[in-house]
């Protein structure tokens, strides 16, 4: 696993413990909380990152209207169960035996139940809509410049293949980034859109998961982009199953 050999750190995940005890004295890094070995040449899965976080001390309208089935992560933080590959287990339970089903980004997609609740498969989130509102600037951003900068960011910083950034919409002051990745499209070694979206969210919140600086400050053609708020919508390959009670 690639880690910075000189001082043995994980460039892509600061929530790790690293030591030169890999094969041939190579630097090896393990995620906090789970103790699982991580590949420092790519993003760590959101499941392992959440587990580590819980273990730590504290013109025409171009904007997309999220589908009625879009999920927003309202439940917040929890200590997840991850499978041996670091993915979320389909069923998550808390210490009081309350259980629920999650999608591939760990967001609840059913009502809460008890230990008898069954989650047959981990449903893939294939479409993520990142909705940003920016603060007033010297002028509106040029759409093509903004598009290029955000695509560059996801390609270079998050190592997400450009084909998975489906679109960047802009209607001042709202920016929307659409990420799409079907099960059939995701090849071995491809960064998952859920992981890229999570890293981006943490960057925007000034809680960067990368070694080094505390956050991410964007510029478009020199112009500072200061984000006012961020909303992320998740669309699953199979619509979520909530009771009507929740919908009202």
């Amino acid at each position: 696993h690639t880690a910075a050999q000189d001082n043995c750190t994980c460039p892509t995940n600061k929530m790790t413990v690293c030591s030169p005890d890999g094969p041939g004295g190579r630097c090896q890094c393990r995620a906090l909380g789970s103790g699982m070995a991580v590949d420092c040449s790519t993003l760590t899965s959101k499941c392992l990152l959440l587990k580590a976080r819980m273990s730590a001390p504290k013109n025409a309208r171009t904007l997309v209207r999220p589908s009625e089935h879009a999920l927003v992560d309202n439940d917040g933080l929890y200590d997840p169960d991850c499978d041996p590959e670091g993915r979320f287990k389909a069923r998550q339970c808390n210490q009081t035996s309350v259980c629920w089903c999650v999608n591939s980004v760990g967001v609840r997609r059913t009502d809460k139940g008890d230990l008898s609740l069954r989650c047959d498969e981990l449903v893939r989130t294939h479409h993520i809509l990142i909705d940003l509102r920016h603060r007033p600037t010297a002028g509106a951003f040029n759409h093509s410049d903004l598009d290029a900068e955000l695509r560059r960011l996801f390609r270079e910083r998050y190592r997400l293949h450009p084909k998975f950034v489906a679109a960047v919409h802009y209607e001042q002051p709202t920016i929307q980034i659409e990420l799409r990745q079907n099960t059939s499209q995701k090849a071995a070694g491809d960064v998952d859109i859920g992981d890229a979206a999570y890293y981006f969210e943490r960057d925007i919140k000034g809680e960067s998961l990368f070694q080094g600086r505390g956050g991410l400050d964007l510029r478009v053609r020199g112009e500072p982009l200061q984000v006012e708020r961020t909303l992320i919508y998740y669309l699953d390959e199979i619509p979520p199953k909530f009771s009507m009670k929740r919908l009202t």
Partner: antibody, heavy 119, light 106 residues
Framework: QVQLVQSGAEVKKPGASVKVSCKAS????????IHWVKQKPGQGLEWIGY????????KYNEKFKGRVTITRDTSASTAYMELSSLRSEDTAVYYC????????????WGQGTLVTVSS | DIQMTQSPSSLSASVGDRVTITCKAS??????LAWYQQKPGKAPKLLIS???SLETGVPSRFSGSGSGKDYTLTISSLQPEDFATYYC????????FGQGTKVEIK
């Protein structure tokens, strides 16, 4: 290396205008905005506004809107801050500053220009 | 506008002392906080950005911490060259500075 060199001290009468320059070198001028910051004698720092040399866009602190104009000359890699209708409370050191390459904090500063307003 | 309240406004300390300066924002600034050092007649110098990241060439005795609205600059062992005025600055919503903390020799 990155350098911001400002024009010399100025003494002005109340009601007059002053124009302070800030010449940038050591980097591509159009890549970063140039901020202007005011510091009254013995007091703290106050953000005035910035110019984006790439497109001439400006953003001002509401407090300074109307009396401050920030401009630039890309061919000379120079930003300017003009303050009109001067009054005694405008007596201050004015700094230009460039952001950090990775954040919106101010990493490189000019040496400052003292503007004294006195009758 | 976001207000930055810095405290104390001044402090007296001796060489070798541990010094702590705090800065409170009027709202969450998501770690978009910088600390500057300014000496008389000189321009401010950036010490820390992103609340915790030490700039290149800044001695490791300086450290930044905090999150949300509350941030701290710590000088672990004060040196003679550290006597100066320190400012915090938020850059989450435009740019505003704290009032400054003057660190004087006791």
């Amino acid at each position: 290396q990155v350098q911001l060199v400002q024009s010399g001290a100025e003494v002005k009468k109340p009601g007059a205008s002053v124009k302070v320059s800030c010449k940038a070198s050591g980097y591509t001028f159009t890549t970063y905005v140039i901020h202007w910051v005011k510091q009254k004698p013995g007091q703290g720092l106050e953000w005035i506004g910035y110019i984006n040399p790439n497109n001439d866009g400006t953003k001002y602190n509401e407090k300074f809107k109307g009396r401050v104009t920030i401009t630039r000359d890309t061919s000379a890699s120079t930003a300017y801050m003009e303050l009109s209708s001067l009054r005694s409370e405008d007596t201050a050191v004015y700094y230009c500053a460039r952001p950090h390459f990775e954040t919106h904090a101010m990493d490189y500063w000019g040496q400052g220009t003292l503007v004294t307003v006195s009758s | 506008d976001i207000q930055m309240t810095q405290s104390p406004s001044s402090l007296s300390a001796s060489v070798g002392d541990r010094v702590t300066i705090t800065c409170k924002a009027s709202e969450d600034i998501f770690n978009r906080l910088a600390w500057y050092q300014q000496k008389p007649g000189k321009a401010p110098k950036l010490l820390i950005s992103g609340a915790t990241s030490l700039e290149t060439g800044v001695p490791s005795r300086f450290s930044g911490s905090g999150s949300g609205k509350d941030y701290t600059l710590t000088i672990s062992s004060l040196q003679p060259e550290d006597f100066a005025t320190y400012y915090c600055q938020q850059y989450w919503n435009t740019w505003t500075f704290g009032q400054g903390t003057k660190v004087e020799i006791k």
